[in-house]
């Protein structure tokens, strides 16, 4: 009689992560008597996957009734495949004895596992930066297989070219990760801008996966200040306004100084938003000129988003206004935010 052959008809099998893999194996004879075992890998370090005779293998089921005496089909199904299951599986016939001895092995079936990349996560710099500065964004995606993957960066739909990408590990692995760093130059118009990392992989049936970062979380647009003197409201009263324009984020504190002395401090609240996402705000100060013998230096000092204060001054000519006889009251500190 012809000697038993172990036939593994599939040289390779490819399975999606989470699915079941069927590994086919048939023998051509019932002799010699003895069990079949399945291993992953070859040599002394091979891993037992299934033993027909004994053991508990919760993820493995036999395709046919392998316990039947005449059975010659020893195909198995492995459930809930993960990338860690990739490898070459061997169906091995043993000869019954004490102990059983290996008789013949199949040629092996290479199991490759296809796994989708995780949703890309984009992260920006820890601290805010101002326009004209270059900031770095990173994008990461994990757990995909095979290794081939493409990653692109976009800013508001325009593809970026200044980035570096690594896929790890470099050698063979059950699954892979991608890490990319892109450099982006900020502009004053970037409050509404988005940076997008796009990952494409063979397993993705839809469009590429996207991760986004809003530049509103990265940019700081410092304000421009303008102090102007309004026409006299009433006798001896002058209205001075401080226009704080085009700033982002909203966190802003304004202090009025009269000849270097703090007159009033207020926090920006009722701001107007510009189309580009920056804010404008206006504060005004009513000054009673009759309280001053000399010219007054009015300073609008702004502290924006925890940064060092910037200021703008305005010289108020007291001599240009008639003085009230016998009046020595202090400058009036009433003021208000205006839209």
């Amino acid at each position: 009689e012809e000697e038993l052959q172990v036939i593994q008809p599939d040289k390779s099998v490819s399975v999606a992560a989470g699915e079941s893999a069927i590994l086919h194996c048939t023998v051509t004879s019932l002799i010699p008597v003895g069990p079949i075992q399945w291993f992953r890998g070859a040599g002394p370090a091979r891993e037992l996957i299934y033993n027909q005779k004994e053991g508990h293998f919760p993820r493995v089921t036999t395709v046919s009734e392998s316990t039947k005496r005449e059975n010659m089909d020893f195909s198995i199904s492995i459930s809930n495949i993960t990338p860690a299951d990739a490898g070459t599986y061997y169906c091995v016939k043993f000869r019954k004895g004490s102990p059983d001895t290996e008789f013949k092995s199949g040629a092996g079936t290479e199991l490759s596992v296809r796994a989708k990349p995780s949703a890309p996560v984009v992260s920006g710099p820890a601290a805010r930066a101002t326009p004209q500065h270059t900031v770095s964004f990173t994008c990461e995606s994990h757990g995909f297989s095979p290794r081939d993957i493409t990653l692109k960066w976009f800013k508001n739909g325009n593809e970026l070219s200044d980035f570096q990408t690594n896929v790890d590990p470099v050698g063979e692995s059950v699954s892979y990760s991608i890490h990319s760093t892109a450099k982006v130059v900020l502009t004053r118009e970037d409050v509404h801008s988005q940076v997008i990392c796009e990952v494409a992989h063979v397993t993705l049936q839809g469009d590429p996966l996207r991760g986004t970062a809003n530049l509103s979380e990265t940019i700081r647009v410092p304000p421009t200040l303008e102090v102007t003197q309004q026409p006299v409201r009433a006798e001896n009263q002058v209205n001075v306004t401080c226009q704080v324009r085009k700033f982002y984020p909203q966190r802003l504190q304004l202090t009025w100084l009269e000849n270097g002395n703090v007159s009033r401090t207020e926090t920006a609240s009722t701001v107007t938003e510009n189309k580009d996402g920056t804010y404008n705000w206006m504060s005004w100060l009513l000054v009673n000129v009759s309280a001053h013998r000399d010219d007054v230096k009015l300073t609008c000092q702004v502290e924006h988003d925890g940064q060092p204060a910037v200021s703008k001054s305005h010289d108020l000519k007291v001599s240009a206004h008639p003085k009230e006889q016998g009046s020595n009251t202090a400058a009036e500190n009433t003021g208000s935010n205006e839209r």
């Epitope: 490819s14 399975v15 081939d148 494409a200 063979v202 397993t203 049936q205 839809g206 469009d207």
Partner: antibody, heavy 116, light 109 residues
């Protein structure tokens, strides 16, 4: 699971023509679908695909000659301005469950003849 | 676009024999290669994908191999039912585009 093309007929140059691919047994919202063609006695030629989310991608030679779109149950190929060179059997196909690198379900094809 | 060069354009072999069809890509396609069988007046039928993975239900007489730019389809123990035209098809993971070889007609004597 199957796909089937329809809409093939005798057309005239310059007159738009729309082919439809109807699927059964699976959802168009889960798979990439493709359009291909085969001129009489010639080989297979890739036209374009539409992703599960509805974004079309075309072969570089298409240059606006075709438009791919889909509804929940059908995928269309519009021949915007056919010429006699577009005479062919048009196939729609679905990519495999493991990835977009191969097509495992093909329709029987529908014949389009563009003639003066 | 990647150009796929398939050879030979036609091959003849006897029942029980072996046929080898080659496909060369203009650049590396990282094993993203599929083989199809098409008989006259019929739709293409997937045989092999990812260079060497046999599609379910396809006899193991069909064997795919290769990597990088060079791929081979081997049909052994030829049967008369194997008479058909065979096409290779690539997918390029960077351009995400597809290309077909010109086809090989297999005639079984």
């Amino acid at each position: 699971q199957s796909v089937e093309e329809s809409g093939g007929r005798l057309g005239t140059p310059g007159t738009p023509l729309t082919l439809t691919c109807t699927v059964s047994g699976f959802s168009l919202s889960s798979y990439v679908m493709g359009w291909f063609r085969q001129a009489p006695g010639k080989g297979l030629e890739y036209i374009g695909i539409i992703s599960s989310s509805g974004s079309p991608y075309y072969a570089s030679w298409v240059n606006g000659r075709f438009t791919i779109s889909k509804t929940s149950t059908t995928m269309d190929l519009k021949m915007n301005s056919p010429t006699t060179e577009d005479t062919a059997t048009y196939f729609c196909a679905r990519v495999g469950p493991l990835g977009v690198d191969y097509f495992n379900i093909w329709g029987p094809g529908t014949l389009v003849t563009v003639s003066l | 676009d990647i150009v796929m060069t398939q050879t030979p354009s036609s091959v003849e072999a006897a029942v029980g024999g072996t046929v080898t069809i080659k496909c060369q890509a203009g650049q590396s396609i990282n094993s993203y290669l599929a083989w199809y069988q098409q008989k006259p007046g019929q739709r293409p039928k997937l045989l092999i994908y990812y260079a060497s993975t046999l599609e379910s239900g396809v006899p193991s007489r069909f064997k795919g191999s290769g990597s990088g730019t060079d791929y081979t389809l081997t049909i052994s123990d030829l049967e008369s039912a194997d008479a058909a035209t065979y096409y290779c098809q690539s997918w390029h993971y960077i351009s995400r585009s597809y290309a077909f070889g010109g086809g090989t007609e297999v005639v079984v004597k």
